[in-house]
Structure formats: structure tokens, C-alpha cells
Interface confidence: medium
């Protein structure tokens, strides 16, 4: 059904409509506001058709804006480097009419000792070196400049910061005779911000530091430091916010304990503990003050660092995150899931939901997936009838309407959206799952049966017969 699309690649989309911009008065940049969907919630297709038609009718005025690509800029300060000593950098697409800046931190796991960093360099060099980076990148999802694909912030200045430090954006050590690799994630962010100030960021009203997976954790680790940096550099009026996607991990007990041999099997607490030492990792000051020396690894876990942050942060997290399951040694191999594992997975969702209870701005669908915000179909998933772009819009409004962080949400504009149904893919808008071996799409009913859920058990709390539930799930309702 339409509600449960697989994530499609951007290349399969129709050509983008041109972007429209208001003419700035007397050379002044004009603030662009996010689209307010309150009045059109019930008829989004018609509204989007009108936006597209308007954009196309204004095409002659803005043909020069048609290029969707973000362009690579290697850092001028070449002492701030990727793991192998090549200069770090960023991809930028400016939007002159906007005072909103989106800085996106890429994800891609980490390495925490010489052996697994060597292995990573052999197999995933792009995540450790800038030598082979392409000149341009296409902005997708929240980085897209198309209102259809990005109804949230399509008109913002878009910055994609590639991950080439393998340190969860926390490192502060350079390459030397003693250190085979540089780990400068935290310094790369600071240097990118410094260089962007000369490219228009100085006039920003809002800087949204976003990231997915390791980049999402990177947001939690760096958002306050970016705010402090801008304040010290004399730009206190720029409001810094965070958007952490798929980076809110739990330091829970693994399903099966394994020794810390490589990145994937090592328990996250142990991997980060070793990593911090190897990277010379830095964590937010206010969090560090709450843990003994040597216990800074705690600050890599969202539910521990979040209460110490000062900048507003919106947390996006699948309740059944694939990376979390991987580090917990849960591998869904195509064999039906045994009861012990099924209970473990359900409990993981319950624990994650609990950690988000005091996070006012959060979006957590009950799906088995990983990352969302730069996927082209990031608009498809809904929690309690609200999509992620809509929730982010409501968050913007709540921050704009009141700097008071009031606990009362705007009427009809929710920002705390956490699924309460208890099993993976009980939310019909979840992205479609594929069988890992055949590549075949599975509908929710097939997936749940594959996961070992007894349909009687699942149907009972809903007050349904198993056959009724199967019918509903098969139709994607």
C-alpha cells in the first residue's frame, strides 16, 4: 500500500520543480518560513500540486536555482583532517533568501583500535579519507531543496559534512609519528562552522545541527559546543538546535555477550570506552562533570547526555533500531525468531520508549529500520497520524512562539510522538521490510509471523480475531 513504501533512490524521482525565492528588499536576505500545513492537513496532495504548479510557473525567474547539487569544499585549514591526514571538508548548497542553515553530520559506525581502523581503511576508505570524494552530492530527504521531498526546510542553506574521522564526531587528536590516524571529528565540526561564517552563516537566524546514526550521536556530543563557539566568535543571536536521527543508543545488556573483537560484536559501552582513549574523545562539559574520570563513555548515550544539554534537541529514533540490534548481537537471519529473542526485541522497544518519556521533542516509530532523515521518503512514516516533517514544523513553531520550553504543546501540533504499540512494524506506515536472503518484500503479517509472533497474542489486546488482524495488516492499515 501507499502507506508503507520501501525507501526509493532519488534517481527514480520525477525531475525536481524549480525552487522559488522572494526577491530580497534592498539586497537584504529575507527570512523564509517553513510551510504551515495546519489548514491543509486533510488535503495534502492537492496542496502539494498547487505548490508544484506555482513553482513551475515561476521557473523562468529561477532557472539558475535548478541545480540540486551540493558542492564540495575542502577545508582551507588543512591541519583539520580525516583519519589519513587528507583535508576534511563539507558539501554546500546556498539558499540566499534564507537565514536557516542545516548542517548534517554523516554516519557510518566507528573504529576504536589500530586493527579495526586498518581494516576499515581497506574496506571503507571513503569514511577515512577525502581523496576520492566526488565533487558534488545530491541533497535528499531533509537536505533536498524540493518542497515535495522536503516540506520542512526545503529553502534552507544545506551543508553535508562527510564522516571521515571514525570517532563518532568526538575526536580531538591529530596524526603524528605516534598516531597512525588522526581523529578530529569534534574539530572538523568547529572548523566547518568557522569557515561557513565567511560564506553567509554569520547572517543566520537558526543553525540546525542534524545527523544520522553515528552522526546523530555526534549531534548530541557537539550541539552545545557549536552554540558556545558561535557565542565566543561574536554571533550570539544565531539559535543553535539539534536533530539527532538514529543516534540514541542504549547501553543495555547484549542478547548474547561476545568478546570485544571488532566494531560490530563489541558491546557499545566497551567499544566507546576504548574509543575515547584512542581518539582523545571529548564530550559535552556539563555531561562530563557528572561522571568520574574514565567514565566519560556514558555521555555517548542519549538518555544520559540529553538532560545536560542546553540547546533544544529533537530526537528521532526507530524503536527497533537495526544498529542497536546489531551491537546487541541480534541478527535476523531469515530463520523464524525464537521466543527468547522475540521477548528481548520487544523489551528493547519498551526500554527505548521509556528513555524518551522526558524528551519533549521526539519521533519514535515502532519499526525495525535505521536512519530516516536523508531518505527521499522520510515524509511517509507517521506516528499517531503525524509525519516527521510535520512534527519538526511543530517543533519550530513551539520554539518560535515561546522561548519558555513550556511543557504544554501547541494545539493540534504535536512534538512528542512515540509509538506505544509493542512489536516491530505494528505501525502500518513503517518502511517495508525485505527478506535478507531473497530480497523479496514482506508485508507486516508475513514479517510478524517470521518474527515468531503468535497472531492470537497480537490480535487479542486489539480486540480482534487473528484473521481480521491479518487482513488489516496485509492491507497496510
Amino acid at each position: 500500500s501507499e502507506g508503507r513504501k520501501t525507501w526509493r533512490r532519488r534517481g527514480q524521482q520525477p525531475p525536481p520543480p524549480p525552487r522559488t525565492e522572494a526577491a530580497p528588499a534592498a539586497g537584504q536576505p529575507v527570512e523564509s518560513f517553513p510551510l504551515d500545513f495546519t489548514a491543509v492537513e486533510g488535503n495534502m496532495d492537492s496542496f502539494m500540486a498547487q505548490v508544484k504548479s506555482l513553482a513551475q510557473s515561476l521557473y523562468p525567474c529561477s532557472a539558475q536555482q535548478l541545480n540540486e547539487d551540493l558542492r564540495l569544499h575542502l577545508l582551507l585549514n588543512t591541519s583539520v583532517t580525516c583519519n589519513d591526514g587528507s583535508p576534511a571538508g563539507y558539501y554546500l548548497k546556498e539558499s540566499r533568501g534564507s537565514r536557516r542553515w542545516l548542517l548534517f553530520l554523516e554516519g557510518g559506525w566507528y573504529c576504536f583500535n589500530r586493527e579495526n581502523c586498518d581494516s576499515r581503511y581497506d574496506t571503507m576508505r571513503r569514511l577515512m579519507s577525502s581523496r576520492d570524494w566526488p565533487r558534488t552530492r545530491t541533497g535528499t530527504g531533509i537536505l533536498s531543496s524540493q518542497p515535495e521531498e522536503n516540506p520542512y526546510w526545503w529553502n534552507a542553506n544545506m551543508v553535508f559534512i562527510p564522516y571521515c574521522s571514525s570517532d563518532v564526531w568526538s575526536g580531538a587528536s591529530s596524526k603524528s609519528e605516534k598516531n597512525e590516524y588522526a581523529f578530529m571529528g569534534a574539530l572538523i565540526i568547529q572548523e566547518v562552522v568557522r569557515e561557513l561564517l565567511g560564506r553567509g552563516l554569520s547572517g543566520a537566524k537558526v543553525l540546525l545541527l542534524a545527523g544520522s546514526s553515528a552522526g546523530g550521536t555526534g549531534v548530541l556530543l557537539n550541539v552545545d559546543r557549536v552554540a558556545e563557539q558561535l557565542e565566543k566568535l561574536g554571533y550570539p543571536a544565531i539559535q543553535v538546535r539539534g536533530l539527532a536521527d538514529s543516534g540514541w543508543f542504549l547501553d543495555n545488556k547484549q542478547y548474547r555477550h561476545t568478546d570485544c573483537v571488532d566494531t560490530i560484536t563489541c558491546a557499545p559501552t566497551e567499544a566507546i570506552r576504548r574509543g575515547i582513549r584512542y581518539w582523545n574523545g571529548v564530550v559535552p562539559e556539563r555531561c562530563r562533570r557528572q561522571f568520574q574520570e574514565g567514565e566519560e563513555w556514558n555521555c555517548f548515550f542519549g538518555y544520559k547526555v540529553y538532560p545536560t544539554l542546553r540547546c533544544p534537541v529533537f530526537v528521532v529514533q526507530w524503536l527497533f533500531d537495526e544498529a542497536q540490534l546489531t551491537v546487541d548481537n541480534v541478527h535476523l537471519t531469515g530463520q523464524p525468531v525464537q521466543e527468547g529473542l522475540r521477548l528481548y526485541i520487544q523489551n528493547l522497544g519498551r526500554e527505548l520508549r521509556h528513555t524518551l518519556k522526558d524528551v519533549p521533542a521526539s519521533f519514535a516509530p515502532a519499526c525495525l529500520s535505521h536512519e530516516i532523515i536523508i531518505r527521499s521518503h522520510w515524509t511517509d512514516v507517521q506516528v499517531k497520524g503525524t509525519s516527521l516533517p510535520r512534527a519538526l514544523h511543530c517543533w519550530d513553531r513551539s520554539l518560535h512562539d515561546s522561548h519558555k520550553a513550556s511543557k504544554t504543546p501547541l494545539k493540534g501540533c504535536p512534538v512528542h510522538l512515540v509509538d506505544s504499540c509493542p512489536w516491530p512494524h505494528c505501525n502500518p506506515s513503517c518502511p517495508t521490510v525485505r527478506d535478507q536472503f531473497t530480497g523479496q518484500e514482506m508485508n507486516v503479517a508475513q514479517f510478524l509471523m517470521h518474527m515468531g509472533f503468535d497472531m492470537q497474542t497480537v490480535a487479542q489486546p486489539q480486540g480482534l480475531e487473528p484473521s481480521e488482524l491479518l487482513g488489516m495488516l496485509s492491507n497496510g492499515s
Epitope: Q239, V240, R289, Q290, P307, R310, D358, K404, A405
Partner: antibody, heavy 117, light 114 residues
């Protein structure tokens, strides 16, 4: 709902030490910090110190050499110990807990009076 | 340390009157990145523990009557009670949580009912 309850020894002789226990319920000391505040009779509030979820302590610098805060997570108890008491340490001693985002004292114990004489 | 000063130290008003009390900090409590003022107000009735009324300088704690309003930014803050009731007899304290240690309180304003 969240509760904190202080229990102390009552009267303390000058130069002796004061020990107060704060027993909490409906939340975990693994997740929240607990603060100590005191109030001399007829006077204002003075922040003494905090023990964070991770076990780190911060103290009011004016008192830090006489003060020690510890906890037992499994018993849901936080302990305040203050040495070398003088008569001007006579006060109502409160433990308090913050919200999960920043340090406002949202939940307070009923306090325990510690007269020094 | 940030020093908090409250004025007046006491005031007496009749039921139904409007009351304002002031709190000043020795340095700004506004954190520009999130535009929040790190200031709270507490009410302490005779023989009771303090109770949180307002945080972020102007956000009312749930359950607090809307006659209590916090305002101000930077270094100057005000607590206003729009129409005093007899049960508002208490000492009111402001507290900064911008910088620690230590968190610091003002000396208090005692509200008496005529």
C-alpha cells in the same frame, strides 16, 4: 509520585559531625541527581551540593572541605555528612530533585531540623 | 559566584491587590543559543518546604494558578501576582541555575497580608 524524605539525628553538639539520609521513591538514583539545600531559622535558602546520577559530586565552595555527599543506588538513599559543626550550621536541611532537563528544584523533601548546641 | 538580589525584602498587601517583586542577578542568565533565562521562582509557606512556581523565568509549573506570572530577561526579573489571595502568604525566592557550582538563591521577599 516522586518523593524524598530526610532523616537526621536531631541535636548535634558543636565540633561534631552531622549525618543526614535522604530516602527517595518513584525514581532511580541511576537516572537523577539529588541536591542538598539548607535554611537557617528565619533566613534564606543556601545550596550545599549535589550528587549526580553518575556519582560525581559538586559542592558549594564555601563548605566543600566540611561536606561530603554519597549514595547507595540499590537502597535509593543519598547521604550528607558535614563535619566540624558550629552553632550557625543550625538549619533545616532539605534534599531535592530536579527535572530531567535542568536544575530547578522541582521535588523537595519535607526537611529535617539539625540544631547545633 | 552569581549573586542574586531580591527586593523588597518584605511587603504587605490586601487581598485582591496586584503585587510585583524584583530579582536581579550579578550577571546575565540568558543563554543566547536557546534564548532561555536560567531563573526559577519558589514559594515557601510558613512551616513548609519550598515549592517550584516558575522556571525558565516565565514558564509556570503545572498546577500553579495563572495569577502568578514571571517576566524579565538577562539580569532583571519580576514575579507578579495579579490578584493576591490569603493563601499566597509566603516567602518568595528566586534562584539562578545558569552557572554552577553553586546554584544561588536570592534573599527572599516576604509577602504579608494586611
Amino acid at each position: 509520585q516522586v518523593q524524598l524524605k530526610e532523616s537526621g539525628p536531631g541535636l548535634v553538639a558543636p565540633s561534631q559531625s552531622l549525618s543526614i539520609t535522604c530516602t527517595v521513591s518513584e525514581f532511580s538514583l541511576n537516572s537523577y541527581g539529588v541536591q542538598w539545600v539548607r535554611q537557617p531559622p528565619g533566613k534564606g535558602l543556601e545550596w550545599l551540593g549535589v550528587i549526580w546520577a553518575g556519582g560525581i559530586t559538586n559542592y558549594n565552595s564555601a563548605l566543600m572541605f566540611r561536606l561530603s555527599i554519597s549514595k547507595d543506588n540499590s537502597k535509593s538513599q543519598v547521604f550528607l555528612k558535614m563535619n566540624s559543626l558550629q552553632t550557625d550550621d543550625t538549619a533545616m536541611y532539605y534534599c531535592a530533585r530536579s527535572y530531567n532537563y535542568d536544575v530547578v528544584f522541582a521535588y523537595w523533601g519535607q526537611g529535617t531540623l539539625a540544631p547545633v548546641s | 559566584d552569581i549573586v542574586m538580589s531580591q527586593s523588597p525584602s518584605s511587603l504587605a498587601v490586601s487581598v485582591g491587590e496586584k503585587v510585583t517583586m524584583s530579582c536581579k542577578s550579578s550577571q546575565s542568565l540568558l543563554y543566547s543559543s536557546n534564548q532561555k533565562n536560567y531563573l526559577a521562582w519558589y514559594q515557601q509557606k510558613p512551616g513548609q518546604s519550598p515549592k517550584l512556581l516558575i522556571y525558565w523565568a516565565s514558564t509556570r509549573e503545572s498546577g500553579v494558578p495563572d495569577r502568578f506570572t514571571g517576566s524579565g530577561s538577562g539580569t532583571d526579573f519580576t514575579l507578579t501576582i495579579s490578584s493576591v489571595k490569603a493563601e499566597d502568604l509566603a516567602v518568595y525566592y528566586c534562584q539562578q541555575y545558569y552557572s554552577y557550582p553553586p546554584y544561588t538563591f536570592g534573599g527572599g521577599t516576604k509577602l504579608e497580608i494586611k
